[in-house]
Amino acid sequence: IPPHVQKSVNNDMIVTDNNGAVKFPQLCKFCDVRFSTCDNQKSCMSNCSITSICEKPQEVCVAVWRKNDENITLETVCHDPKLPYHDFILEDAASPKCIMKEKKKPGETFFMCSCSSDECNDNIIFSEEYNTSNPD
């Protein structure tokens, strides 16, 4: 941190390494929950027009796709991977792409992904041909 910028105690708004280098925050699509037409596709765009600066530098991009008898929704947010989201751990937070993984939720089909490149939750990928070992 530059000497003229105060470092406050217990500050999670700034992340530094041992040399004092500062981590810039993630840029993510952030439209909360919106109705979606994304269904039976290998990948979808979020159709979220808001790219937001995540509040804390450790936060990553998250997308949550849900389908029930009534509708389909897509949620796009920033979230701290140290904390569960919808009761699930963000296990793929370091991925550059948002690869959807199905989670068990009663009464609905529930997919979630997280990723850590700018606006990576704009393109959500359901296709089996992508996996965590894929270098792309």
Epitope: P2, G20, V22, K23, L27
Partner: nanobody, 124 residues
Framework: EVQLLESGGGLVQPGGSLRLSCAAS???????RMWWVRQAPGKGLEWVS?????????YYARSVYGRFTISRDNSKNTLYLQMNSLRAEDTAVYYC?????????????????WGQGTLVTVSS
């Protein structure tokens, strides 16, 4: 020598407006994503807004979305922040900072990545 020099701060009433400027020199301005970052008294840094080097794509924190507008004039090597509908919670020192697009960290603690800041006080 890299320099980032902010100006335009001051005392303004709630609901008022201010325009901040950041004059950049000593580096190739058009290669950097530029940021406005603020620090309220006794608080941590808040990343307010960013703008891409070319194409002028802009990004905002949710706390300022719709009230603040970031812009840049690459011919003048200057970054701007137009702040409207100011609130007491916008009171802070405002810094400009530079980032190589795609790079997640600044280089080191001595970095020439930050200006000295300009104080904005919103109070009646």
């Amino acid at each position: 020598e890299v320099q980032l020099l902010e100006s335009g701060g001051g005392l303004v009433q709630p609901g008022g407006s201010l325009r901040l400027s950041c004059a950049a020199s000593g580096f190739t301005f058009t290669e950097y994503r530029m940021w406005w970052v603020r620090q309220a008294p006794g608080k941590g840094l808040e990343w307010v807004s960013a703008i891409e080097p070319i194409g002028n794509r802009t990004y905002y924190a949710r706390s300022v979305y719709g009230r603040f507008t970031i812009s840049r004039d690459n011919s003048k090597n200057t970054l701007y922040l137009q702040m409207n509908s100011l609130r007491a919670e916008d009171t802070a020192v405002y810094y400009c900072a530079k980032q190589i697009p795609g790079r997640k960290w600044t280089a080191n603690s001595r970095f020439d990545y930050w200006g000295q800041g300009t104080l904005v006080t919103v109070s009646s």
